[in-house]
Structure formats: structure tokens, C-alpha cells
């Protein structure tokens, strides 16, 4: 699948604003953002 979000404006995607009196920063926690950041998750310990 192609990345469905436009990389040119990835700085504040998925930022739905206030919810239950605080900000829900989806921008920092979306699948697309995780791909852009290129994080490598730690492998599970054996």
C-alpha cells in the first residue's frame, strides 16, 4: 500500500485537537508518522 498521507505536510497530520479537556496528538502517533520517522522497534527479549 502507498502511504495514504501526503509527506509534504506531515508535521501536523492526525491532530484532532481537544478531547476530554486535553489535546489528542494523533499526528505523533499515526501509522504514517511512524513510517516517516523510520523508527525501528526494539526486538522482543528472548
Amino acid at each position: 500500500l502507498a502511504d495514504p498521507l501526503d509527506h509534504r505536510d506531515a508535521g501536523d497530520l492526525w491532530f484532532p485537537g481537544e478531547s476530554e479537556s486535553f489535546e489528542d496528538a494523533h499526528v505523533e502517533h499515526s501509522i504514517s508518522r511512524s513510517l516517516l520517522e523510520g523508527e525501528i522497534p526494539f526486538p522482543p527479549t528472548s
Epitope: L5, F15, H29, S30, I31
Partner: antibody, heavy 114, light 112 residues
């Protein structure tokens, strides 16, 4: 390639329980907030549950229609999320999607009927 | 809850013509940082929803630029400038500003 694959759907009787699994791959999972959204036979989409990341203490949120009956959880080591569904009602009959709101799985059918 | 209503609920369009779908919210979707939390999805027959537009007017990557989104705090429009065969399906608006997150009832687009 990003993949979200839901499993565990079936035909169950009212009052019974069922557990759905969403296995993900192709992206760094641990920091991603995940959701379950369902689609009724009438094709209406309904957001039902949300789970945040470990850094957010795995905070969870639910739609009123499932609160107290459904539980969302995740296992970062398996890059999977789950939906434990108890006290199922006929109104819970739907296709259940695992999603990050940008990417969606293919969905799994849950039918609640006597 | 934030209720989203769509109009029309069904739409029949000749290929090559334009189409517009309206979505109205019962509450303002203008959040912090002046971001408007209105999203459009297309669900093609037998498929999962796919993202078209995010934050009211931003085109998701891979989506043809014949799609565009516009609106204000409570009234929104999805426009398809030249409808093609692959555009057939059900279009949903959604808001991710307040819990519970909500979706519109959908607009079914068919070809004449």
C-alpha cells in the same frame, strides 16, 4: 508494506463472548495509537474503541454503546491489538475494522444471532 | 455527540461530470492550531474505507487531484471535478476532534 489483518470473527449467540485480533506489520507499532471501527449491516461506520501507546499508559477510550462490555488491548511485542467482546448483543453484528485512521485492515465479520 | 449529516445520500453522475457531496457537523470542528478535523473516506464496493482528504482540505497521497475538500467550521464539501469509473462507492465524512469519534451516514455515488 503496511498490513493490518483482523481475525477471530464468527457467528455467536447473544450473551456470549468473542475476541478479535488485529496483527500488524510493516511499520513501527509501539508508538502508534490504534482503533477499532465497526460497520453495521446498514453500512454505518461506528468508532468503538481506541488505545494509546505505552508512553501514554495504554490509555483506552470507548463508545458508550460498548463501554463495560468490550475491552481493547495491545501487545507491542506481537505488534497486535485485540478486542475482547463480552455480553454480545444482536446489535453488535457488524464488520469490525482495525485502523490507525489512515490505514485500515480488511475487516472481519461478527454475527450475533440466536 | 458530534453528529455528521451528509447530502445527498445517493448520487448518480455521468462520467466526466463533476460531483459534490455536503457534510454538516452539529458542532464546530475547528480545533487547536486552527486545524479543522474533518476527513473524507471512500469505500469502494467490497473494500475497506480509504482516506481521501484529511484536515478538511488536504489531499492524501496517492489520491487523484480531481478530489478536493473545502468548508468552514461546520459545513464541508467534497468535490470530484471529473468523475471516473473508479470513483464509484460510498463516501463518508468523519470527525476526530471529540470523543466519540463519528462518521456521517455515507453518500453512495453511482454512474449513469
Amino acid at each position: 508494506e503496511v498490513q493490518l489483518v483482523e481475525t477471530g470473527g464468527s457467528l455467536v449467540q447473544p450473551g456470549k463472548s468473542l475476541k478479535l485480533t488485529c496483527a500488524t506489520s510493516g511499520f513501527p507499532f509501539s508508538n502508534v495509537w490504534m482503533h477499532w471501527v465497526r460497520q453495521s449491516p446498514e453500512k454505518q461506520l461506528e468508532w468503538i474503541a481506541h488505545i494509546k501507546a505505552k508512553s501514554d499508559n495504554y490509555a483506552t477510550y470507548y463508545a458508550e454503546s460498548v463501554k463495560g462490555r468490550f475491552t481493547i488491548s495491545r501487545d507491542d511485542s506481537k505488534t497486535s491489538i485485540y478486542l475482547q467482546m463480552n455480553s454480545l448483543k444482536e446489535d453488535d453484528t457488524a464488520i469490525y475494522y482495525c485502523t490507525g485512521l489512515d490505514y485500515w485492515g480488511q475487516g472481519v465479520m461478527v454475527t450475533v444471532s440466536s | 455527540d458530534t453528529v455528521l449529516t451528509q447530502a445527498p445520500l445517493s448520487l448518480s453522475v455521468t462520467p466526466g461530470e463533476s460531483a459534490s457531496i455536503s457534510c454538516r457537523s452539529s458542532k464546530s470542528l475547528l480545533g487547536v492550531r486552527d486545524i479543522t478535523s474533518l476527513y473524507w473516506y471512500l469505500q469502494k464496493p467490497g473494500k475497506s474505507p480509504q482516506l481521501l482528504i484529511y484536515r478538511m482540505s488536504n489531499l492524501a497521497s496517492g489520491v487523484p487531484d480531481r478530489f478536493s475538500g473545502s468548508g468552514s467550521e461546520t459545513d464541508f464539501t467534497l468535490k470530484i471535478s471529473e468523475v471516473e469509473t473508479e470513483d464509484v462507492g460510498v463516501y463518508y465524512c468523519a470527525q476526530f476532534l471529540r470523543y466519540p469519534y463519528t462518521f456521517g451516514p455515507g453518500t453512495k455515488l453511482e454512474l449513469k
